[in-house]
Structure formats: C-alpha cells, structure tokens
C-alpha cells in the first residue's frame, strides 16, 4: 500500500521536511503532489510525467519544493503555513490511480526566554513576587528551575497563565535563589539567564558574643553583636540605657566594677524598617578568677556492701564557692541512700551497695571559674553471698542479680571456698 512518511514529523520553522514515499507502484505514468487531504487542482504543488521527465508546477508551488527520484517531496525553508496534510496522486501506466496522504506540523524555533519580575526587592513574610517568562509563545510549554532544580512543592508557590507565571507568596529568605524559566516545543528548548531573587529580611534578634557574664577588674571587655539581616543591619550600643556608639563591636579596656550593668545591642535595617535589641548583663567582680583544685577525703575507700557506710569530703580553701559531686559522669545524689551536707562539702552513702563502686569526684565553682578534684575509687566488697543468689551451672558458681544471670561474679575478696562449701552442703 502506498504510504507517506514525514521526516521529521515535527518541523522547525526555517528547516526542511521530506515527505518520503513508501511502496511506490511500478510502471508509472506520472504523479502529482497536492496540499491538503484530497486531490484538488487548485491546490496542486507539482506534477511530474515520467516518460518526458517533465515537471509542471501547480498553483500551490512555492519555489521551495523538490521532487526526488522515488517521488518523495522535499520542502525547504519551512514556514508556519506549511503545517498540515499533503496528498500524493499516482497515475499508473494502466491509468489506474492511487493516493496517499501524509502530514507534518510546523513549530517556531524558540527564542531565548527572559524573566520579568513585578518586585525586585521583596520583604520577607510581607511581599509576593510574580515572575513571568517572556515572550508568550503559542504551543510552547513553560518550565521553571530554582537553583537548577525543578520547582519544589510548596503551598506558597503558584503557577498560572499556562505555567508562564510563577508567583511566590509571603517570600522568605530561603526563597533567595537563582530562578530560570525554560520554553519547550517539539522542535526546541531554550532556557533563560538566571534571575537572582534578593529577599530583604531582618534583622533577627541579635546575639552578643562572647557569652561570658563575669569579668575581672582590669580585664578588657570586647563585645560583638550580630543579627542576620539583608541588607546588613546597622548596630548601636547602649549601656544601662545610655547610647554609647554606632558600631558592631564594643570595646572597653581595663574595666572596673563600675562597668557592671546591662549592655544593649540595637540592630536596625533601614530598608525593611525593622529593628531588634538584645540585652546582656555584665558583672565585673573581685571573685577569685582561679579556683584551687579541691581534694577528696574518704572515711574509707574499701567497704563491705549492705553493711558499711562511707563519707566523702570535698576539701577546698576557697571562699564564695559552690560544690557539686559526680559519680561515673552523673551528677549526685542519685539515690535516697546518698545525702549531701555542710553545703555539699560531704557526701554520705548509707548503706553502700554494690552499684556504688566506682569513681567519684567533686567540682568547686564560683560565677567566673571552676575546678575539679582528682577522682577517688570506692571499692565495694561482699564477704558472703546470700544463698538465694547463688546458682550452679556446669559446676560453675554464678551470682544472680535481680535482672537475670550475670557474668561470673568476681567481686573482690569473696570467700569462694567458704561460699561454695556452704552451697554444696545444702545440695
């Protein structure tokens, strides 16, 4: 069967298309090409008589068509009006006619798009921004890219106008990014240059660093203030409510106790019209800047579990200090058997249990300094084990705690022979 194939089917304006003929019959008298889906003399492009090799242009001939030896038709310099159907009419030597129709579509070669914006300096949480991809092109698909990624899903992002317009509602600083639009049709794809969205925001609540509150007389006080802001914030300092200077850093050398007070950093963004403040209390004190290392004294370091008690004392010569105790990196007291007394100087454990064995240390501190003791090791022994906690597994003696079978219990100085003899006596 006679058929027509368009190569390509989607043709760019200015390019060319070949209407390729398949299964052309043998013994032809001639053939004609027509614009449209039927044979119409008013729409004949060209006719060809094989015997004379004579071609005759018709009313629809544009000067851009060429007939190939196999009756295929090449159309050059394609224009939008060329879109549509083409019919080949074949006249065989026996004067029997045959027809076939093919078609192609014409699309413009897309220009490089550009992005227009209705707001070049939107303010965070206040403004919306609408980007529009220019120009408007028929039969084009519009796509958007943010930092070269496809659009994220967000209730604040809305596509409209056939995806040609991208609107960002209540912009945030996180919307500050590179935006591109892309136009596509079946014959081309073009991407715009980047448009950088510059969202104005802030200032956020300022932070004052360093975080120290306590200073010694004679030290230098150097404070720095920072607040996230676009454009960058302008800073000013107040001490006890009195304006000092308009800088980001505040420096006071050789401070005295008179420099104690409230230090306020004021951050202002003149473009957003917003300002924020943070207040920091500075205390200049004669308190010892270096707390001496305390020492622990123990009433005993090896005790018998469930029987003995122990007192640990944290010794220090410093005044105006506080004391806290630690056991295995945990703050104490951690059970009802532990008591602190004499302003936390003494830690009493009564009675001592097996789980109390381990490392203890104390820490002494004042508002501007701290120090900790060397650790002390408390050993907990058991001279005998209650019968109900001993079980025999493969002639090995084990200690069974409340939570099941433990590893071989190797507490120091247990009289194993005595315990084992006792165990065998009852079995």
């Amino acid at each position: 069967k006679l058929t027509i194939e368009s190569t390509p089917f989607n043709v760019a304006e200015g390019k060319e298309v070949l209407l390729l003929v398949h299964n052309l019959p043998q013994h032809l008298f001639g053939y004609s090409w027509y614009k449209g889906e039927r044979v119409d003399g008013n729409r004949q492009i060209i006719g060809y008589v094989i015997g004379t090799q004579q071609a005759t242009p018709g009313p629809a001939y544009s000067g851009r068509e060429i007939i190939y030896p196999n009756a295929s038709l090449l159309i050059q310099n394609i224009i939008q009006n060329d879109t549509g159907f083409y019919t080949l009419h074949v006249i065989k030597s026996d004067l029997v006619n045959e027809e076939a129709t093919g078609q192609f579509r014409v699309y413009p070669e897309l220009p490089k798009p550009s992005i227009s914006s209705n707001n070049s300096k939107p303010v965070e949480d206040k403004d919306a921004v609408a980007f529009t991809c220019e120009p408007e092109t028929q039969d084009a698909t519009y796509l958007w890219w943010v930092n070269n990624q496809s659009l994220p899903v967000s209730p604040r992002l809305q596509l409209s106008n056939g995806n040609r317009t991208l609107t960002l509602f209540n912009v945030t600083r996180n919307d500050s990014a590179s935006y591109k639009c892309e136009t596509q049709n079946p014959v081309s794809a073009r991407r715009s240059d980047s448009v950088i969205l510059n969202v104005l925001y802030g200032p956020d609540t300022p932070t004052i660093s360093p975080s120290d509150t306590y200073y010694r007389p004679g030290a230098n006080l150097s404070l720095s203030c920072y607040a996230a802001s676009n454009p960058p914030a302008q800073y000013s300092w107040l001490i006890n409510g009195t304006f000092q200077q308009s800088t980001q850093e505040l420096f006071i050398p050789n401070i005295t106790v008179n420099n104690s007070g409230s230090y306020t950093c004021h951050a202002n963004n003149s473009v957003t019209g917003c300002n924020r403040t943070t207040v920091k209390t500075i205390i200049v004190t004669e308190l010892s800047p270096v707390v001496a290392k305390p020492q622990i004294k123990a009433s005993k370091t090896t005790v018998t579990g469930d029987k003995d008690s122990v007192n640990l004392t944290c010794s220090t010569n410093d005044t105006g200090i506080s004391i806290r105790w630690f056991f295995k990196n945990q703050s104490l007291p951690s059970s009802e058997r532990m008591k602190l007394s004499q302003g936390n100087i003494t830690l009493s454990i009564n009675p001592v249990k097996r789980e109390d064995a381990g490392t203890y240390w104390c820490e002494v501190f004042n508002p501007i300094s701290k120090n900790q003791s060397d650790p002390i090791m408390l050993n907990v022994n058991y001279n005998a084990l209650p019968q109900e906690n001993l079980i025999n597994v493969d002639e090995q003696l084990y200690f069974q705690g409340g939570s099941g079978l433990n590893d071989i219990f190797e507490a120091q100085k247990i009289e194993w022979h005595e315990a084992r003899a006792h165990h065998h006596h009852h079995h």
């Epitope: 060209i46 071609a55 851009r64 007939i67 050059q76």
Partner: nanobody, 119 residues
C-alpha cells in the same frame, strides 16, 4: 544558463578513495533554496541519488548505501560542490552525475564522470 561540470573520476582499488568535483555556473550554490547533489547510474541498476546538500544551510542527505563512507560538501567561494568517496567498493562503480533540481532532481545534470572500483 545552468551548467554543471564534473571531474575527479577514475580507476581505484577497493578500499581506496576519490574526490569528485562539480563546478556550477548559471546559479549561485549558496542561494537559500538551492540544492546540489550527486546521482549515479550503473548498468542494470536504478539510478540513485547518493548525496545532496543545501550549501546555504549545510543540510545533507545520503543514500543508505553510502552513509558513513561518502561526504558531500561545498565551497561557495568557488561555486563548487564535492563528493569525497572513501572505502570504495566494486558496487560503487558507476557514472556519477552532478545534479541541480529546479522542480526535480532530473532538471539539470552535468555530463558525468566515471568511477571504476576494481582490483
């Protein structure tokens, strides 16, 4: 008056190369709707449009039988088209005609140049 003059044919061994030239006059090969091409005729075979080019746009087409072996090109300053033929085979033996279509590829032909591929 349109004239096409071919040259460059000859005898070549299989696997060899030849370059055919087609000097055109009476029209400008760089005009936007102008095509130029090479048609070959061999005894007992149908004539075949082996390669064609639009010199203004650089569009080229090749017959499946020569794809990857033949290259068509033009030099618009000389108003001349070329056919570079590599890896020649015995079945490439034919008379090669330079052709310029007005309506069809039969409209204007040169006198032809003979290519013989034989060992």
């Amino acid at each position: 008056e349109v004239q096409l003059v071919e040259s460059g044919g000859g005898l070549v061994q299989p696997g060899g190369s030849l370059r055919l030239s087609c000097a055109a006059s009476g029209f400008n090969i760089k005009d936007s709707s102008t095509y130029i091409g090479w048609v070959r005729r061999a005894p007992g075979k149908e004539e075949e449009l082996v390669a064609s080019i639009s010199c203004s746009r650089g569009n080229t087409r090749y017959a499946d039988s020569v794809k990857g072996r033949f290259t068509i090109s033009c030099d618009t300053s000389k108003n001349t088209a070329y056919l570079q033929m590599n890896s020649l085979r015995a079945e490439d033996t034919a008379v090669y005609y330079c052709a310029h279509p007005r309506y069809t590829w039969y409209d204007y032909w040169g006198q032809g140049t003979t290519v013989t591929v034989s060992s």
